[in-house]
């Protein structure tokens, strides 16, 4: 594991990374839940969508999210890999024309209606973590991850590799 400077050096590359294709390399419809098996749900309220983290009743249907995966090239000077280095980026859409967005000023995760090409705020670097969980790092704010705070999704700053394993930024993807 490496310390604060290591995380920052790695994630600094996200600012300059470029999506290598306008089409996703694959798409996947899945339910999203927390490390502790709470479901991420989406509700239409007053013509806007709210995002909740909650325990579902038995046999209650889980909301699905369309995950679209894109390849993103590391800038060669950052990764030390020349043109070799790639990252896997993802956008998350729970319903047509709406995508999860990182609001870095408010440290919040919001659903925004928008057209393609999507803004950078809709892209997250996918990290495979332990226990077959994943984490989502903001493209626009390296070192900041989607996490759970007070039964809502929020943006959480991670400043050391040890904190990358904290449960509140770990999510599970499931087809069921």
């Amino acid at each position: 594991a490496f310390g604060i400077s290591g995380v920052q050096k790695y994630t600094r590359a996200l600012h300059d990374s470029s999506i290598t294709g306008i089409s996703p390399i694959t798409e996947y419809l899945a339910s999203l839940s927390t490390y502790n098996d709470q479901s991420i749900t989406f509700a239409l309220e007053d013509e806007s969508y709210e995002i909740y983290v909650e325990d579902l009743k038995k046999d209650e249907k889980k909301d699905k999210v369309l995950l679209s995966y894109y390849e993103s090239q590391h800038p060669s000077n950052e990764s030390g890999d020349g043109v070799d280095g790639k990252m896997l980026m993802v956008t998350l859409s729970p319903t047509k024309d709406f995508w999860l967005h990182a609001n870095n000023k408010e440290h919040s995760v919001e659903l925004h209606k928008c057209e393609k090409p999507l803004p950078d705020q809709a892209f997250f670097v996918l990290h495979n973590m332990h226990s077959n969980c994943v984490s989502f790092e903001c493209k626009t704010d390296p070192g900041v991850f989607i996490g759970v705070k007070d039964n809502h999704l929020a943006l959480i700053k991670v400043d050391s590799s040890e904190n990358l394993c904290t449960e509140n930024i770990l999510f599970k993807l499931s087809e069921t």
Epitope: A1, Y10, Y69, L164
Partner: antibody, heavy 122, light 107 residues
Framework: EVQLVESGGGLVQPGGSLRLSCAAS????????MTWVRQVPGKGLEGVSA????????YYTDSVKGRFTISRDNSKNTLFLQMNSLRAEDTAVYFC???????????????WGQGTLVTVSS | DIQMTQSPSSVSVSVGDRVTITCRAS??????LAWYQQKPGKAPKLLIY???SLQSGVPSRFSGSGSGTDFTLTISSLQPEDFATYYC?????????FGGGTKVEIK
Amino acid sequence: EVQLVESGGGLVQPGGSLRLSCAASGFTLRSYFMTWVRQVPGKGLEGVSAISGISGGTYYTDSVKGRFTISRDNSKNTLFLQMNSLRAEDTAVYFCARTVYSSSYYGGFQHWGQGTLVTVSS
Amino acid sequence: DIQMTQSPSSVSVSVGDRVTITCRASQGISSWLAWYQQKPGKAPKLLIYVASSLQSGVPSRFSGSGSGTDFTLTISSLQPEDFATYYCQQTNSFPLTFGGGTKVEIK
């Protein structure tokens, strides 16, 4: 150019230990998922262990849990596999490999070393 | 653990033939599948990743398809250098498991 060079293989008695090394060049080791894969001569491939780039989290296949330890030295850009309590069934060529994607194993393994042979026999 | 079943285990073909190798996962793995080529005494070489993405430098006669549980590697017109063993690997979840391999031999 990305290069992975394994070393440390050899003949060891059952119950003995070996430490395999994988020297990486052309990229930053700590930015990528790395894995050890083994192959019994003439047989198929088996994933043994892996380590996450950014978090350092480790993974093991059931047959080596508690006996093998994967680690890395970031300053030397080198990956290790410490193998203890070795058994005859651990005899294989051991490869280290690097993922396509820096933060994810979803893309599989793009770069491989040449392999190092471990023989466990009395 | 996810089991990967590859078929056939071996196939005898001629140069110029079309070759199809299939791989079946014991549970859904979305598109998280890779295909490798291995020649005797050498390390595996990545051909296809994310089920259908062609690795840079790999000839276009290689292609991959499928999602969920059923996947296919196709070599459209076999060349002399393609005689080798081919492996699929699920990259969906740990432990990342390989198929048993398909040996492509000269008829």
